[in-house]
Amino acid sequence: CKAMHVAQPAVVLASSRGIASFVCEYASPGKATEVRVTVLRQADSQVTEVCAATYMMGNELTFLDDSICTGTSSGNQVNLTIQGLRAMDTGLYICKVELMYPPPYYLGIGNGTQIYVIDPEPCPDSDF
């Protein structure tokens, strides 16, 4: 059976500006020309979509204008960046890859990246 394996880091720490980046890599069982990458957030047993983008192999990954995600692609590797994160957004972020075209369709799901977000301490007032 041809399976599609998806690899992503286990843990990532967001920057003080609330930006987290990680690589999502997939082993393609076929020669896909169109790929969809989705970032899912799993909290308890609820899974929600954070962002999604479809790209043609060899072209750039394009998220919607209002998306909190950006990314670049290189072969079977996608570099994902999620911005605007706050402490309450700490959780498991799953990379889902779908080979959309040509058929057959293939689904691949990573084990998830635990993203830790720490809200920056407010700057103390200065007495000058």
């Epitope: 059976c1 041809k2 899974v47 929600t48 075209y101």
Partner: antibody
Amino acid sequence: GVVQPGRSLRLSCVASGFIFSSHGIHWVRQAPGKGLEWVAVIWYDGRNKDYADSVKGRFTISRDNSKNTLYLQMNSLRAEDTAVYYCARVAPLGPLDYWGQGTLVTVSS
Amino acid sequence: SPGTLSLSPGERATLSCRASQSISSNFLAWYQQKPGQAPRLLIYRPSSRATGIPDSFSGSGSGTDFTLTISRLEPEDFALYYCQQYGTSPFTFGPGTKVDIK
């Protein structure tokens, strides 16, 4: 509905309560007293589709995301297409998590 | 398999699903169907319970052999059960197992 062999029929499935365009949607059928048979799937913006061999070339799946509606155009119907047809939503992690109540299609002369 | 499982309420039910080839990344789901109703998702990949499914239902397995276990049968659990692979098209269903009252 009841339709004669060789004729056509279009099924529709209206969804609500979720962001329709963010999910793939399947058609699954069940002949009387038989098991579930996958028929077709359509993904997201409607450009990518896949069909079971038994319906390829006869059935066409489509969707209108502005109307939250899924369609199945069935042409050249045969007696063996008689079944209850279900639409089902693809969950974020892949299985079919919500199913319509089903529509009975009877192909008979 | 088997096609029909005849058991009594309170008993343990073990249903098996065997694939002809290894299932991609264990993308296997189990559905329950009662007469006149649409199927309902129970378990996916292959041991996560769907929302609202009691913990008496559990799934296990990998590769080609998968199992759905109902630890203690309640009257409402007597129904038809189907497995399905959803990792690649075509998205095939198993033939189904009927769990009926002995």
